[in-house]
């Protein structure tokens, strides 16, 4: 199949990093500067992504692969491929329209991004609070008093945290 295809379409012989140049009798020409082709047989090369301003270059563009951006220090990426940058806050805070604000009592955030989430309600599982929660950490639930018999497990890990939402700029 490959041989048949190459007989029919000379462009299929052009490797990644080149394009099939119609202006030059379908010769394989190297991708021009600031462009790339990640697969063979391309009739054009794609423009490289540019990382400027709040974005910084994580991976340089090459003739065969696109540039990759991430955010400058103090920011984190939002969206697939880092399409936007959002300011970091400290643990124990969340980003609001008025900037980074401490988590309200009864909530916590153990990351530099995302929203403050309510402490786990141990009593819903019939357990008691073993370690109090803080702005930065969830409570740790322990066994209920009735479970405190020899050989009983002493600590239950907290419920898994929900995926943090995207908080306002």
């Amino acid at each position: 199949f490959e041989r048949t295809r190459s007989l029919q379409d000379p462009c299929s012989n052009c490797p990644a990093g080149t394009f099939c140049d119609n202006n030059r009798n379908q010769i394989c020409s190297p991708c021009p500067p600031n462009s790339f082709s990640s697969a063979g047989g391309q009739r054009t090369c794609d423009i490289c992504r540019q990382c400027k301003g709040v974005f910084r270059t994580r991976k340089e563009c090459s003739s065969t692969s696109n540039a990759e951006c991430d955010c400058t220090p103090g920011f984190h990426c939002l969206g697939a491929g880092c399409s936007m940058c959002e300011q970091d806050c400290k643990q124990g805070q969340e980003l609001t329209k008025k900037g980074c604000k401490d988590c309200c009592f009864g909530t916590f955030n153990d990351q530099k991004r995302g929203i403050c989430r309510p402490w786990t309600n141990c009593s819903l599982d019939g357990k008691s609070v073993l370690v109090n929660g803080t702005k930065e950490r969830d409570v740790v639930c322990g066994p209920s008093p009735a479970d405190l018999s020899p050989g009983a497990s002493s600590v239950t890990p907290p419920a898994p945290a929900r995926e943090p939402g995207h908080s306002p700029q």
């Epitope: 423009i47 301003g53 969206g79 491929g81 700029q169």
Partner: antibody, heavy 115, light 107 residues
């Protein structure tokens, strides 16, 4: 709260220099850059250029010979200067914070170029 | 520069209907397309970033899709406040560019 506000003369004579300022609050000028974007009456949006948090600039090639964007951190202001203006430069001029997708804009200021 | 072409130029629909707006790029821009809503006398407002991510506070009737050169903004059920001009913009390569806009008007 993040706020940007453009200001400057609403009327500029042809061949003169248009000067606008973008006064910001709610964020640090050393952390964020700003873009300038304009919109002629009844038309679409056109990117003029940007100044980054480190002070370097990028301009649209269509304006590069007559545009200057600068920052005055002491006044919390960015500025745009566009020289040798013509009637075609009549537009609403916006500044927008650099976050990768223009989430925060000023309200815009209309500049009319006329003698 | 990358040219973004929006269609249709004007879309006439009634509240409750579904709106589909198109944006085509002259080059591959990955998923680095944003959508903005603009009402008369106001600045544009970010709706969608990264082709499909709803920005904070944007109702879930707004959704974006696409990658490469073809992008779509869908408003699933039009509310009276949705009638406005919509722009797509690319943040992939400089100079940053915008489409010419689609006017969404009440039928």
């Amino acid at each position: 709260q993040v706020q940007l506000q453009e200001s400057g003369p609403g009327l500029v004579k042809p061949s003169e220099t248009l000067s606008l300022t973008c006064t910001v609050s709610g964020f640090s000028l050393t952390t964020y850059g700003v873009h300038w974007i304009r919109q002629p009456p009844g038309k679409g949006l056109e990117w003029i250029g940007a100044i980054w948090s480190g002070g370097s600039t990028d301009y649209n090639a269509a304006f590069i010979s007559r545009v200057t964007i600068s920052v005055d951190t002491s006044k919390n202001q960015f500025s745009l200067k566009l020289s040798s203006v013509t009637a075609a430069d009549t537009a609403v001029y916006y500044c927008a914070r650099d976050d990768g997708s223009f989430a925060n804009w000023g309200q815009g200021t209309l500049v009319t170029v006329s003698s | 520069e990358i040219v973004l072409t929006q269609s249709p130029g004007t879309l006439s629909l009634s509240p409750g209907e579904r709106a589909t707006l198109s944006c085509k790029a002259s080059e591959n821009v990955g998923t680095y397309v944003s959508w903005y809503q603009q009402k008369p006398g106001q600045a544009p407002r970010l709706l969608i970033y990264g082709a499909s991510n709803r920005y904070t506070g944007i109702p879930d009737r707004f959704s974006g899709s696409g990658s490469g050169t073809d992008f779509t903004l869908t408003i699933s059920r039009l509310e009276p406040e949705d009638f406005a001009v919509y722009y797509c913009g690319q943040t992939y390569s400089y100079p940053l560019t915008f489409g010419q806009g689609t006017r969404l008007e009440i039928k």
